[in-house]
Amino acid sequence: RAPRCRELPAQKWWHTGALYRIGDLQAFQGHGAGNLAGLKGRLDYLSSLKVKGLVLGPIHKNQKDDVAQTDLLQIDPNFGSKEDFDSLLQSAKKKSIRVILDLTPNYRGENSWFSTQVDTVATKVKDALEFWLQAGVDGFQVRDIENLKDASSFLAEWQNITKGFSEDRLLIAGTNSSDLQQILSLLESNKDLLLTSSYLSDSGSTGEHTKSLVTQYLNATGNRWCSWSLSQARLLTSFLPAQLLRLYQLMLFTLPGTPVFSYGDEIGLDAAALPGQPMEAPVMLWDESSFPDIPGAVSANMTVKGQSEDPGSLLSLFRRLSDQRSKERSLLHGDFHAFSAGPGLFSYIRHWDQNERFLVVLNFGDVGLSAGLQASDLPASASLPAKADLLLSTQPGREEGSPLELERLKLEPHEGLLLRFPYAA
């Protein structure tokens, strides 16, 4: 008799793929644009990335460091009107993109939460949650919560308001902290809270260190749903050298949880390559004319247009990974098992019941390595086959779809492999 199928877990929309942050509308759109109407015109691009949610803003009225002149219910007229916002919501809904609104109050000021009048600010946030939920927003983000006194209790209250409206609504909190204990204390009292942090931001050194960070986090959080990013707001290039971007894309898309990216991560947008651009929000490079300040500073392969035409580009890799992440059960909600593969490597399996399984092998080092996959580390339910098909490599030159012998697996410097193999009873 055929084995019984494992019961599928309840899946919320943010479990099904990546979130895409647009913290600065003007930088994202460029060319002196930067409003909600213009963003609506970019939704097709977001659809092409197969992201499930757009984390937008903040876009509310905020006079720097002035509580009285900060209104979380009013859209800053520079960004547009409520009508523009409503139109964006309706268009996003038609394209199955959810909209998450950033309500970090004092986003133009020194302290994101103002240094005094905590209760007043918290009440403003409560009002805003209720107002925007009724206006059709799918969730909220609040950042820099390390600056918010009694953050845990406020987050619990805001989570109650969000979930009280609908279980299908999401609250994301962001912190600059990379300390696991601080992160756990925030998560402890807040079931279903999605937390972005700097936890992984210093993981770029070795495969062992990254493996240790990831497994510690997953063990500590138990069966909670996680999110994966390198920070609460910044670009991957703020933390990683260019040669590790592909590796990290592959990792973030295949770890168990929701991957969270900032606009530009998909093309390797790097503020350091654009003189005069702010590190936290450089102009998005749609094409070579996006950064006219210094003629010739931007080549085609740095832009959306150029990378869209190149199947070997970072953008093309992002699209493929995003597509896989959103449709394969083992990547959507599969179990995770990390195991030893040799120094400098991080490898793990994702599997769900009798569905196709995935093996990820990541070489963080700058030398080629042979992978010694230690299958003995794995439980019987996640055993490795002798061969697996190569779904994709982060480096060009490999023949995709070809079976690879796992005992003889060799990885190029900074190479990541995504392999697939069938369930075997």
């Epitope: 209760d119 007043t120 403003k124 009002d127 009724q134 206006a135 059709g136 308001i161 009280g164 299908d168």
Partner: antibody, heavy 119, light 114 residues
Amino acid sequence: QVQLKESGPGLVAPSQSLSITCTVSGFSLTSYGVHWIRQPPGKGLEWLGLIWAGGSINYNSALMSRLSISKDNSKSQVFLKMNSLETEDTAMYYCARKGHMYSYAMDYWGQGTSVTVSS
Amino acid sequence: DIVMTQSPSSLTVTAGEKVTMSCKSSQSLLNSGNQKTYLTWYQQKPGQPPKLLIYWASTRESGVPDRFTGSGSGTEFTLTISSVQAEDLAVYYCQNDYSYPPWTFGGGTKLEIK
């Protein structure tokens, strides 16, 4: 128990401004929002605006240029100010509590204050 | 702005009868986010302020007699009084409290008792 009480001038000359105070008891203005509504004699109800617990304000856009709503939490008072009054602004003016989460329904109303605009 | 239209503008009934009145909105008041319909009914007796009867189209406010029932979805709504009492003499208003302001009222239905 929850109570709201409006107090106003009664008679206002055309082109002058109107100030009404709504004094509340039985609940805190830091926990509930307050709506303003008016009703011309023998006619229906018109929503004017809402001041939220945190102080944000939604106005009826048709009257926004003439309308100002504010509050003093410590005195449990909400204020409505309207400029450039015309005879069409003659009405009963009510304040009412926004009583339910995820709803703009008004669960408690004041008795209203009658305002006549006439020279 | 959402336009609310009530009908009839007035009706006269005998005590004990069942009465229904209608309210139509110019756009749907269903919030797909929580599947609630954002329509409210008020009762205004002569010389008094309005009183909240029903919110979310069908949720009776506490203390409101169960002879009052709200129904409908989308753009068409009904307030039903199963057995009219003499004290129900009043004007009944519907109000949209959906999404963005202004939260507009209907013109009212005046209920008179024979």
